[in-house]
């Protein structure tokens, strides 16, 4: 008797919607690369199902997933970057679903870090700066960055701004006197590599300072 | 082609430290894989000690962690094990392979070494 | 750590014949599973390895199967220079662990 499923278990399988998605990260931990795959259907009784990645590989031909909860992940140098390769959910040697997908055009960037912003008295405006660890990347560099910023009271209403560089200039003007604000960013591969959106930065909070009277210009903070 | 090939003394005494080396050829111990450390005592049971990875980072056996280094000398494309305090139980045929981490397989490993500890 | 049990420690068999060997994980180790033959005086070699498997340039007589913690290894029609050790290993969490290994013996 072999581990895997059994006949009437894989005719149950079957039945089942064994949808996934995947991301890759690239150079995400020295020059190692990961690619995360979940099912889409969050009750899929995942207890004997494996991903496996074959093809585009460096010096092997197929290479098997870790698992850890629902999330199946691989961390590895071996990925060539260049073509297609074949994804598949498998029950002991029985692929249930498979995918080819090139892991260049499913790219998740890392989070962008060290949001913050500086008000310029003399200028009357303030100066958002962030970092991304993709500047020192040799594959994914070039990415389109999203600052969203809100007025802490207002839930739903962010305004968001696309750039390529990690710095961006707000104008005073333009924000509410004397109101809490909150700042995130994300980015997204923006040249060769296609992608999905990072996760968002943590989010950073400011005050915009009153207005002075005499002025009718804004006190510093 | 991949070849390992292991280096030590042969005999140590008691509570002394076993130092060998795994000399590679034919891949970059730098490029990529896991480069292990495995023994097998003289019942034949394989007792798998540890790795450095290509990047330099290492992992050990908890039941070794205290007493086991394992380094390398990427200039002589050449990994070492170090282990202190031995005792007769760690006689045993000691192995350098490559594999394991993102592979499930040792796939080349070296000839062997005995090693005999006693005084 | 993962304890790994094969069986049995030993067997006898014909040429010819065919042989399986078992290994069970204490925990689920999903597809991390490789099989090793070792001759005496020489270094283990693969065989099988993600559990199904086989190594460059094995003889198809040598297969595997099972995954999450039942795995098995067969030898179709055994040659003279199968008689020899067989191990199991898994890869799924450090410290990576063996079986206790399968002398094979000529009937």
């Known amino acids: 008797e072999s581990g895997y499923a059994q006949n009437g278990d894989l005719e149950d399988a079957e039945l089942d919607d064994y949808s996934f998605s995947c991301y890759s990260q690239l150079e995400v931990n020295g020059s190692q690369h990961s690619l995360t795959c979940a099912f889409e259907d969050p009750d899929v009784n995942i207890t004997n199902l494996e991903f496996e990645i074959c093809g585009a590989l460096v010096e092997v031909k197929c290479l098997n997933f870790r698992k850890l909860q629902e999330i199946y992940f691989i961390e590895t140098k071996k990925f060539l970057l260049i073509g297609k390769s074949n994804i598949c959910v498998k029950v002991g040697e029985k692929s249930l679903t498979c995918k080819k997908i090139d892991l260049t055009t499913i790219v998740k960037p890392e989070a962008p870090f060290d949001l913050s912003v500086v008000y310029r008295e003399g200028a009357n405006d303030f100066v958002v700066t962030f970092n991304t660890s993709h500047l020192q990347k040799k594959y994914v560099k070039v990415l389109m960055h999203d600052v969203a910023y809100r007025q802490e009271k207002d839930e739903n209403k962010w305004t968001h701004v696309n750039l390529s560089s990690t710095k961006l200039t707000l104008l005073q003007r333009k924000l509410q006197p004397a109101a809490m604000y909150e700042i995130k960013v994300r980015s997204i591969p923006d040249h060769y590599f296609k992608g999905f959106w990072s996760e968002w930065s943590p989010s950073y909070y400011f005050r915009t300072p009153e207005i002075n009277n005499s002025s009718g210009e804004m006190d510093p903070i | 082609d991949v070849q390992l090939q292991e280096s030590g003394p042969g005999l140590v005494k008691p509570s002394q430290s076993l130092s060998l080396t795994c000399t590679v050829t034919g891949y970059s111990i730098t490029t990529d894989y896991a480069w292990n450390w495995i023994r097998q005592f003289p019942g034949n049971k394989l007792e798998w000690m540890g790795y450095?990875?290509?990047?330099?980072?290492?992992t050990y056996t908890p039941s070794l962690k205290s007493r086991i280094s394992i380094t390398r000398d990427t200039s002589k494309n050449q990994f070492f094990l170090q282990l202190n305090s031995v005792t007769t139980e760690d006689t045993a045929t000691y192995y350098c392979?490559?594999?394991?981490?993102?592979?499930?397989?040792?796939?080349?490993w070296g000839q062997g070494t005995t090693l005999t500890v006693s005084s | 750590d993962i304890q790994m049990t094969q069986s049995p420690a030993s067997q006898s068999a014909s040429l010819g014949e065919s042989v399986t060997i078992t290994c069970l994980a204490s925990?689920?180790?999903?597809?991390?599973l490789a099989w090793y033959q070792q001759k005496p005086g020489k270094s283990p070699q693969l065989l099988i390895y993600a559990a199904t498997r086989l190594a460059d340039g094995v003889p198809s007589r040598f297969s595997g199967s099972g995954s999450g913690t039942k795995f098995s290894f067969k030898i179709s029609s055994l040659q003279a220079e199968d008689f020899v050790s067989y191990y199991c290993?898994?890869?799924?969490?450090?410290?990576?662990?063996f079986g206790g290994g399968t002398k094979l013996e000529i009937k």
């Open positions: 925990q689920t180790i999903g597809a991390w």
């Open positions: 392979a490559r594999g394991g981490y993102d592979v499930n397989y040792f796939d080349y």
């Open positions: 450095i990875f290509y990047s330099g980072s290492t």
């Open positions: 290993q898994q890869f799924f969490s450090t410290p990576w662990t």
